[in-house]
Interface confidence: medium
C-alpha cells in the first residue's frame, strides 16, 4: 500500500540547538512512500499492526507509535471503603445454640435487632454503610461483626476514612458504656458489657494515583506526574497544557523524549527562535547569503 506523508513548511529546532527542519518540498506535490514487507516493523515501541493501523501501547501514539502522549488516563474508583472488625458483648440476650445457625429465626431476630441498634449507634457518620455479623458465641452473646464504611474518592479519602473509623470507635465505646443492664433489666434496644468491646482489625481500600501513573508511563515514569483538577487526578507530562507543571514552549512545540520534556522551536518567515523555552527570538537578516 502507498502512504501519503504530509509535508510541513515549518521547521523546528530543538532547544539544544540542532535544527529539525522538513525538506523544502513544493507543498502541491504529494510525496508518497511505498511500504513493503512486514507491516509489524513499522509499529515501534511494542505497537502492533492490526491490518489497518498501528495499535499502540500506553504511553505511545502516532502512525508508528513513535510519539509519547501528553496525558495518560487513570481511573480512580468512584468510591473507597473501609472494613472494621469489631467485637461487642450483648448482655440483654441469652446465648442459645440456635444463634449459631444463620438460617434460624433466633439468629434472624438477633441480626435485625443488632443491625438496628448499630444504625442508631453510628447515626451521624456519613460514611457508615452497615454492619455484618460474622460470628456469634457464648458469653452472653459475643458478637463478632464488621462495620462497613464507604466514601466518594477524593485525594483525602484516607483521612476521611481514618476519621470515620475513629468516630466508630468513640461511638461504640460510648454506647457499650452507657447501655448496660440495670437490675437485670435493659431499657434500651440492646444492652452491653462495657469490657467486651474490641477493635480487632481495620482494612482500608488502597488506591494511589501516583503509582498508577508511574506504572502506565513505563520508562517515562520520572517525567509524568499527578495533578488534581476538581478532586480528580490527572496523569500528565509537562507537555500537557493547562496544569501547574505544564511546560511553556512559547514559540515552539513541547515534545517528550527519554530525557524528559523539551521544546522544539519554530522558525518563521521572519524569526528564528531558540532557548530552552523558545522565548528568544532572532530576526532573520533581510540579506540573502549565497555560498
Amino acid at each position: 500500500p502507498l502512504a501519503t506523508i504530509p509535508v510541513s513548511t515549518t521547521s523546528l529546532t530543538s532547544s539544544e540547538g540542532s535544527t529539525i527542519s522538513t525538506p523544502s518540498v513544493d507543498i502541491s506535490t504529494p510525496v508518497t512512500t511505498s511500504i513493503v514487507g512486514d507491516q509489524c516493523s513499522r509499529c515501534k515501541n511494542g505497537g502492533f499492526w492490526d491490518g489497518l493501523k498501528c495499535q499502540c501501547l500506553t504511553p505511545y501514539y502516532g502512525e508508528s507509535c513513535e510519539e509519547v502522549v501528553n496525558s495518560i488516563d487513570i481511573a480512580p474508583p468512584e468510591t473507597v471503603s473501609a472494613q472494621m472488625e469489631l467485637t461487642v458483648t450483648v448482655t440483654s440476650v441469652k446465648f442459645t445454640d440456635e444463634l449459631k445457625n444463620h438460617s434460624s429465626q433466633e439468629f434472624r431476630e438477633f441480626n435485625k435487632t443488632f443491625t438496628e441498634q448499630m444504625n442508631i449507634v453510628y447515626s451521624g457518620i456519613p460514611e457508615y454503610v452497615g454492619v455484618n455479623i460474622t460470628n456469634l458465641r457464648l458469653g452472653s452473646v459475643v458478637v463478632e461483626h464488621d462495620v462497613l464504611l464507604r466514601t466518594k474518592y477524593t485525594p483525602e479519602y484516607k483521612t476521611a476514612l481514618d476519621n470515620a473509623t475513629e468516630v466508630v470507635k468513640q461511638k461504640i465505646t460510648k454506647v457499650t458504656t452507657e447501655q448496660i443492664m440495670t437490675n437485670d433489666n435493659c431499657s434500651a434496644l440492646m444492652c452491653f458489657n462495657t469490657t467486651g468491646t474490641q477493635v480487632q482489625n481495620i482494612t482500608v481500600t488502597q488506591y494511589d494515583p501516583v503509582e498508577e501513573c508511574r506504572q502506565k508511563a513505563e520508562e517515562y515514569e520520572d517525567y509524568f506526574l499527578v495533578e488534581y483538577r476538581d478532586q480528580k487526578p490527572y496523569c500528565i507530562s509537562p507537555c500537557e497544557s493547562g496544569f501547574n507543571a505544564s511546560k511553556n514552549c512559547n514559540h515552539g512545540k513541547c515534545q517528550m523524549s527519554q530525557n524528559g520534556a523539551r521544546c522544539l522551536c519554530v522558525t518563521t518567515e521572519t524569526h528564528w527562535y531558540s532557548g530552552e523555552d523558545c522565548n528568544q527570538g532572532t530576526q532573520k537578516s533581510h540579506h540573502h547569503h549565497h555560498h
Epitope: 434472624r108 435485625k112 444504625n119 451521624g124 456519613p126 457508615y128 434496644l189
Partner: antibody, heavy 121, light 108 residues
Framework: QVQLVESGGGVVQPGRSLRLSCAAS????????MHWVRQAPGKCLEWVAG????????YYAEAVKGRFTISRDTSKNTLYLQMNSLRAEDTAVYYC??????????????WGQGTLVTVSS | SYELTQSPSVSVSPGQTASITCSGD??????TSWYQQKPGQSPVLVIY???KRPSGIPERFSGSNSGNTATLTISGTQAMDEADYYC??????????FGCGTKLTVLR
C-alpha cells in the same frame, strides 16, 4: 412541639418543574434524616426520597430517579424536593416526614400536613 | 422490588379486637412500623420496631412480627380508631416500602 409545614404545591403541566419546601421547627433539624412520601388521591402511601442529616446520602424511589432531587438547608431548617419532567402519575399529596435518626434508616415519627401537586394539561 | 401486602378492609365491633396483617418475604427480618391515617389527615406513627409504641399512643395498640407476617392488634377497639392503617418496612435492600393500607371500620 415538632412541626413540619410543606409548601410549593399547585397545578403544573406535564414536563414542567416544581419545587416543594418543608419548613421544620420544634426540633434540631440537623439531627434528623428527612423524607418525602406521597399519596395519590384515594391511593396508598408511596415513599419518594430520603436524605441523611448531613446530606451525605440521598435515596430515591425508582419512579422518580433522575427527575426528582432532594436537598436540605440546615441554616434555614428547610427540606426541599425539586421535581422536574413531571408526569400525570406524579399527581399526589406530598408529605414531608422526619426520620428518627440522623441516617434515614428508620421509621417516620412526625409528618407534615402535606401539599397537593396536580400534573395536568 | 419488595412488596408489602395488606388486606383492603377489616371490620370490627366496638370493644372487640381488630387484627390487621401485613405480609412480605422474610418480613420478620425487617423492622415494621404502623401508621394510622384518618380521612383528610396526615399519617401518625402508632407502632415502631415491630412492637413499640410512641408516647401518646394508647396501650390498646400492639404489634408483632415474625416469619413473613407483621400484625397490628387493636384490643378494645373504639370508634375513634376507625382509619386507614399502613404498614412500613425498611432496610438497605428494600429502602422504605409501604403496604397499600387496610381500612378499619368500627361497626355502629
Amino acid at each position: 412541639q415538632v412541626q413540619l409545614v410543606e409548601s410549593g404545591g399547585g397545578v403544573v403541566q406535564p414536563g414542567r418543574s416544581l419545587r416543594l419546601s418543608c419548613a421544620a421547627s420544634g426540633f434540631t433539624f440537623s439531627n434528623h434524616g428527612m423524607h418525602w412520601v406521597r399519596q395519590a388521591p384515594g391511593k396508598c402511601l408511596e415513599w419518594v426520597a430520603g436524605i441523611w442529616s448531613d446530606a451525605s446520602n440521598k435515596y430515591y424511589a425508582e419512579a422518580v430517579k433522575g427527575r426528582f432531587t432532594i436537598s436540605r438547608d440546615t441554616s434555614k431548617n428547610t427540606l426541599y424536593l425539586q421535581m422536574n419532567s413531571l408526569r400525570a402519575e406524579d399527581t399526589a399529596v406530598y408529605y414531608c416526614a422526619r426520620a428518627t435518626y440522623t441516617t434515614g434508616w428508620s421509621y417516620f415519627d412526625y409528618w407534615g400536613q402535606g401539599t397537593l401537586v396536580t400534573v395536568s394539561s | 422490588s419488595y412488596e408489602l401486602t395488606q388486606s383492603p378492609s377489616v371490620s370490627v365491633s366496638p370493644g372487640q379486637t381488630a387484627s390487621i396483617t401485613c405480609s412480605g418475604d422474610k418480613l420478620g427480618d425487617k423492622y415494621t412500623s404502623w401508621y394510622q391515617q384518618k380521612p383528610g389527615q396526615s399519617p401518625v406513627l402508632v407502632i415502631y420496631h415491630d412492637r413499640k409504641r410512641p408516647s401518646g399512643i394508647p396501650e390498646r395498640f400492639s404489634g408483632s412480627n415474625s416469619g413473613n407476617t407483621a400484625t397490628l392488634t387493636i384490643s378494645g377497639t373504639q370508634a375513634m380508631d376507625e382509619a386507614d392503617y399502613y404498614c412500613q418496612a425498611y432496610d438497605r435492600s428494600t429502602a422504605w416500602v409501604f403496604g397499600c393500607g387496610t381500612k378499619l371500620t368500627v361497626l355502629r
